[in-house]
Amino acid sequence: ITCPPPMSVEHADIWVKSYSLYSRERYICNSGFKRKAGTSSLTECVLNKATNVAHWTTPSLKCIRDPALVHQRPAPPSTVTTAGVTPQPESLSPSGKEPAASSPSSNNTAATTAAIVPGSQLMPSKSPSTGTTEISSHESSHGTPSQTTAKNWELTASASHQPPGVYPQGHSDTT
């Protein structure tokens, strides 16, 4: 049993290392924001015994503007993304080679196949190690990831800013 991607939190981001039951993850506030005292960034994948469905607990996190960090660039505003549009994020490598989803090229890689679910941002669902990722979409509700549909995906070993509504199957800048 695994959890779907966690809910989005305003002005915060998350990179999930594991979607497994009882896994604990932390949100982090965007640049220019800080965690409000008394709120918690922790979320845990727990099982609802009544429905036998796993879900992430709701963090009490509130990210507020941090006047001490005004020199850091604040998070760019989110943009609505449309499922079905081929994502075009920045390129890190000019390589045009396509990876083989079935065989990660090295032992420190994890591969997942993304299946787009219409209606939202692309968000996969699963934990480290090779697997198939089913991605659902969900419009970004805040200043976390956003410029491109693919930008918010989180992969096998990590998931970030993933909104609710993703269906776990095989989970997964320039200065």
């Epitope: 981001d13 990179w15 965007n30 640049s31 850091q72 660039r73 998070a75 760019p76 081929t86 994502p87 075009q88 994020p89 920045e90 390129s91 890190l92 490598s93 390589s95 045009g96 080679k97 396509e98 990876p99 989803a101 990660p104 090229s105 090295s106 420190n108 890689t109 994890a110 591969a111 997942t112 196949t113 993304a114 299946a115 787009i116 692309l122 996969p124 480290p128 990722t133 991605i135 200043g143 976390t144 990831p145 956003s146 410029q147 491109t148 693919a150 930008k151 918010n152 995906w153 989180e154 992969l155 096998t156 070993a157 990590s158 970030s160 800013h161 997964s172 800048d173 320039t174």
Partner: nanobody
Framework: EVQLVESGGGLVQAGGSARLSCAAS????????TAWFRQTPGEQREVVAI???????SYADFVKGRFTISRDNAQDSVYLQMNGLKPEDTAIYYC????????????????WGQGTQVTVSS
């Protein structure tokens, strides 16, 4: 073969600085997100900073104002500038990047480096 190689770790005096580099090679497709994590003995790996492909950046509370994540597309590298280091920053630091293939639907991949040890002495 995909490789992520971290460097820049070592022994640093408290209050000092270090710049970690993560050089990527053989990455297929285009970059999505990058992040730095750290892990101390007996503890879970924790996120330090995340940089999304669109430029959005987030930092963990414990490094805010001290660490800066950046990227150099031309060099296929990701960096973590660490200033005002404290003994509690001692850990193995890992970089992670996520890419997606150009086909449709895209395939999502994540790659992790092997880590570089940073030791901050008081």
């Amino acid at each position: 073969e995909v490789q992520l190689v971290e460097s820049g770790g070592g022994l640093v005096q408290a209050g000092g600085s270090a710049r970690l580099s993560c050089a990527a090679s053989g990455i297929p497709g285009t970059l999505n997100d990058t992040a730095w994590f750290r892990q101390t003995p007996g503890e879970q790996r924790e996120v330090v900073a995340i940089r999304r492909s669109g430029g959005n950046i987030s930092y963990a509370d414990f490094v805010k104002g001290r660490f800066t994540i950046s990227r150099d597309n031309a060099q296929d590298s990701v960096y973590l500038q660490m200033n005002g280091l404290k003994p509690e920053d001692t850990a193995i630091y890992y970089c992670a990047i996520a890419v997606f293939s150009r086909d449709f639907p895209p395939k999502r991949y994540e790659y992790w480096g092997q880590g570089t040890q940073v030791t901050v002495s008081s």
